[in-house]
């Protein structure tokens, strides 16, 4: 091909090539042709004769102002035609007359201001019609019933001001899953406008300035329709009352989106007419008071998003939003509740009472004063089968005994990014009989005791990153009870002292993060009593991160028990010489990181076993000694291996001898070296 199109599996990509005409030298069997972002002004039908197998043609982002009706004659199998971002202004009855097999027609962002006659009457198989971002002033797309298989009609960002039944009755035989009318200036819903459509399942009116009274009229028009999904995001719905959604009483609405409405007042029984609702989006509003009956009637809601729905108006404490006790009691089917990023004063004793099916609750950054978690804080969740609780970013400073004793089903508890500073007695976790993961990373300080985790033997993941961990060297180890632990993160704690039994009994441990500590002394032969073998017995460990610990020595048997190790990170240490058989047992090693150490020599006797099955190696920024003795074997291995070695050319440079300084390691000439073959 003389053009620079890329062709793969019957797909030709000719985008972004400044083409002024359709290429005539592509394979004739292509089924997909992408001509987007070029300079095409027209699509001569003759140019497509050779591409009769096309099922998808995308000519978006060109300057096409007219379509030849014969185009589709040449493309009898065409299913998808994308003409978005062009300069079409007129559509005649002939334009798509031969495009009878189309399932998708994309005409967004053109200059179509009016549809005359019936340009889509032949599109009996059309499923998606996108006319968004044009200048249409009405929904009139034809004069006779048509488009009986249409499921998605996208008319957002036009100039539609009214919905009229006489304009929508062309869809009398259609079942529209999605009628997208967002970002229009709709001021009127004429009587029967939605009944003109055969069946309407989804209506999207985001960014339409409806306000409370037009919303009420809209809902009355939707009465006795098949509507399931209704989206009214950013529609200036500042208040709701018990009549706002009255019309929806005669529907089976399952999804309602009222996000971004600056909604201030949610009157009692506002949603009493929505007993079938399952998904309710209320995020980014400004609710000042949730009354005990505001959510009354929502018996079937499974998902409720209240993210950033309760925000304070001013600095004054008096302006904090209120949530009445028992406000959620009606939501008997609620499983997922998101209350992130709010300014709620605290948790009242009956705040969550009645949520008997709640499984996921996010309270991240939700409260203005939740400094202490007491044994009463979560009492209202006592009858909820909560599995996941997110309490991050709440400035929590203390967890008292029995704080979670009500949450016997809890599996994941996230307390990260708070200000917790305390001794962990273990009583904090009492009652968490099914706990799987506790995330405590990024807190003020945690002092461990032998019983810190005595009551949670089911725990499989424990995250203690950057918590100024104290007492980790006590014996018995605070982790002794955690025999099911698979992930332990102790990174960024500046730990300098640990015992050889710190991880004893953790035979199921798979991931151990110890990076950014101060463990160097423990592996020194000069350490009083000798090196500390704190990794012993971890026979199922897969990932070990020891980056940034200041290690300058590795005892020869330190990895002896780690038969299943797949990834080891020893980067950013001070390692120079490694003992000969240090990696002998790492037969499963896939990734080895030794970047930014002081390694000068990469010899077979040390690295041979580790490199055997490696898929990724990172030894960048080491001061390699480019001599036969030091790196000949390594260079030969590099040049024969399939292992991925990022930045090999630029960041593997010789440091010594002086005449090789800055020279790429991989270009070192080993031909004069003897016995340097990487594989035997």
């Amino acid at each position: 091909s003389t053009t620079k199109c890329t062709v793969s599996h019957e797909v030709a990509d000719c985008s972004h090539l400044k083409l002024t005409q359709v290429p005539d030298d592509l394979p004739t069997n292509i089924t997909v042709l992408n001509l987007t972002h070029n300079q095409l002004r027209r699509l001569p039908a003759a140019n497509f004769t050779r591409y009769s197998q096309l099922t998808s043609l995308d000519v978006g982002f060109n300057t096409i102002s007219k379509l030849e009706p014969e185009l589709c004659q040449k493309l009898p199998m065409l299913k998808v035609l994308n003409l978005q971002h062009n300069e079409l202004s007129q559509l005649s009855d002939k334009t798509f007359a031969f495009c009878t097999n189309l399932t998708e027609l994309h005409l967004m962002s053109n200059s179509i201001q009016k549809i005359k006659n019936n340009p889509f009457v032949k599109q009996k198989n059309l499923i998606t019609l996108d006319l968004s971002h044009n200048g249409l002033s009405s929904t009139k797309l034809g004069t006779q019933v048509q488009l009986e298989n249409l499921q998605e009609l996208l008319l957002s960002n036009n100039k539609i001001q009214a919905l009229k039944s006489e304009e929508l009755d062309i869809f009398a035989n259609s079942s529209l899953k999605k009628l997208e009318l967002s970002s229009n200036q709709i001021k009127e819903f004429s009587p029967g406008c939605f009944h003109a459509i055969g069946r309407l399942f989804g209506l999207f009116l985001n960014n339409v300035q409806l306000g409370p009274s037009l919303t009420e009229k809209l809902c009355l028009e939707l009465a006795n329709t098949s509507i399931r999904n209704l989206s009214l995001s950013n529609s200036q719905l500042s208040t709701t009352s018990n009549t706002t959604f009255l019309g929806l009483k005669w529907t089976n609405l399952t999804m309602l989106d009222l996000s971004y409405n600056n909604l201030n007042v949610v009157g009692n029984d506002s949603f009493a007419w929505l007993p079938q609702l399952e998904y309710f989006f209320l995020e980014y509003n400004n609710i000042q008071h949730l009354f005990s009956h505001s959510l009354h009637g929502l018996f079937n809601v499974r998902y409720l998003n209240l993210k950033r729905s309760f925000t304070k108006q001013s600095i004054s404490l008096a302006s904090l939003p209120k949530i009445d006790d028992f406000s959620f009691q009606w939501l008997k089917c609620l499983e997922h509740l998101n209350m992130e990023d709010n300014d709620i004063p605290g948790i009242k004793s009956n705040m969550f009472t009645g949520l008997i099916n709640l499984k996921y609750l996010s309270l991240s950054n939700s409260f203005t004063s939740l400094r202490t978690l007491t044994n009463e804080t979560f009492v209202s969740l006592a009858h909820s089968p909560l599995h996941i609780l997110n309490l991050t970013k709440n400035k929590i400073s203390k967890i008292e005994s029995d704080a979670f004793s009500w949450l016997g089903h809890l599996e994941v508890l996230d307390l990260g990014l708070n200000e917790i500073g305390q001794e962990l007695t273990g009583q904090e976790w009492r009652g968490l009989e099914n706990i799987f993961e506790i995330y405590l990373s990024y807190n003020k300080y945690l002092q461990l005791t032998r019983n810190s985790f005595a009551l949670v033997p089911s725990l499989q993941r424990l995250m203690l990153r950057r918590v100024a961990l104290k007492n980790v060297d006590s014996s018995p180890s605070p982790f002794q009870p955690l025999r099911n632990l698979t992930i332990l993160d102790l990174s960024n704690n500046n730990i300098a002292n640990i015992n050889d039994d710190m991880l004893e009994g953790l035979e199921k441990l798979e991931i151990l993060d110890l990076q950014h500590n101060n463990l160097a002394r423990l592996w020194k032969h000069a350490n009083p009593g000798g090196p500390i073998y704190f990794l012993k017995g971890l026979s199922h460990l897969h990932i070990l991160n020891l980056e940034s610990n200041g290690f300058d020595e590795i005892p020869v048997e330190v990895f002896k028990d780690l038969f299943e190790l797949k990834i080891i990170d020893l980067g950013l240490n001070n390692l120079n010489t490694l003992p000969a058989s240090v990696f002998n047992n790492q037969v499963s090693l896939k990734s080895l990181n030794l970047q930014k150490n002081l390694i000068t020599s990469v010899e077979k006797k040390v690295f041979g076993p580790a490199f055997r099955n490696l898929t990724e190696l990172d030894m960048r920024f080491n001061p390699f000694d480019c001599t036969c003795e030091s790196i000949a074997w390594f260079v030969n291995w590099i040049n024969e291996t399939h292992t991925n070695i990022p930045e090999l050319s630029s960041h593997y440079l010789c440091n010594t001898p002086p005449h090789y300084h800055g020279f790429p390691v991989r270009l070192f000439d080993t031909s004069s070296c003897k016995d340097s073959a990487p594989f035997e």
């Epitope: 009492r430 005791t449 019983n451 009551l455 025999r483 050889d500 039994d501 009994g505």
Partner: antibody, heavy 119, light 107 residues
């Protein structure tokens, strides 16, 4: 099943030493700490100390620290408690015990070893 | 060291009676309290741990309660095999001291 079997009864003279053994079976010996508890006739139980069979690390009750030595032999799956400078008030039944999944109780006990100190 | 005090030291009761034994710690031991039953010439047997959790195989007539410093062991309906000496022990910090015991006798 987990079993802790202790050595037989001993009679010792004041000032002597006694070494009681506790052989473990039914589990991996090095996985759980072994505790020693004693009970003098008609007295309450007294916790003496604990040993990590894996590395031999020990925590003693200060009351006994100068006289008691707790050791282990991993190859024999056996823990030992030696008490020196015996006096008559050391006459007691000496028990070894082990924690379970919950480390806050002793579900497993040896049968006890009676040590009599008499001149 | 934390001292454990049991009361009463002994008590007489009849089969079918409800019996309560208390245990007080000299400091806060949270809920790290265990109860043991011991019969003459035998090793102690674990009944309850973490103040209220029943050990494996222990009949439901036994129950425990309390937290901090004050704890109770209750036998709801005494059975003939329940006559024995009962000890509490804390597991908060070493040394793990025991109570002096409560001897439960047949009236």
């Amino acid at each position: 099943q987990v079993q802790l079997v202790q050595s037989g009864a001993e009679v010792k003279k004041p000032g002597a030493s006694v070494k009681v053994s506790c052989k473990a079976s039914g589990y991996t010996f090095t996985t759980y700490w072994i505790h020693w508890v004693r009970q003098a006739p008609g007295q309450r139980l007294e916790w003496m100390g604990e040993i990590n069979p894996n590395n031999g690390r020990i925590n003693y009750n200060e009351k006994f620290k100068t006289r008691v030595t707790i050791t282990r032999d991993t190859s024999a799956s056996t823990a030992y408690m030696e008490l020196s400078s015996l006096r008559s008030e050391d006459t007691a039944v000496y028990y070894c015990a082990r924690v379970g999944v919950m480390i806050t109780t002793f579900p497993y006990w040896g049968q006890g070893t009676l040590v009599t100190v008499s001149s | 060291d934390i001292q454990m005090t049991q009361s009463p030291s002994s008590l007489s009761a009849s089969v079918g009676d409800r019996v309560t034994i208390t245990c007080r710690a000299s400091g806060n031991i949270h809920n790290y309290l265990a109860w043991f039953q011991q019969k003459p010439g035998k090793a102690p047997k674990s009944l309850i741990y973490n103040a209220k959790t029943l050990a494996d195989g222990v009949p439901s007539r036994f129950s425990g309660s309390g937290s901090g410093t004050d704890f109770t062991l209750t036998i709801s309906s005494l059975q003939p095999e329940d006559f024995a000496t009962y000890y509490c022990q804390h597991f908060w910090s070493t040394p793990f001291t025991f109570g002096q015991g409560t001897k439960l006798e047949i009236k």
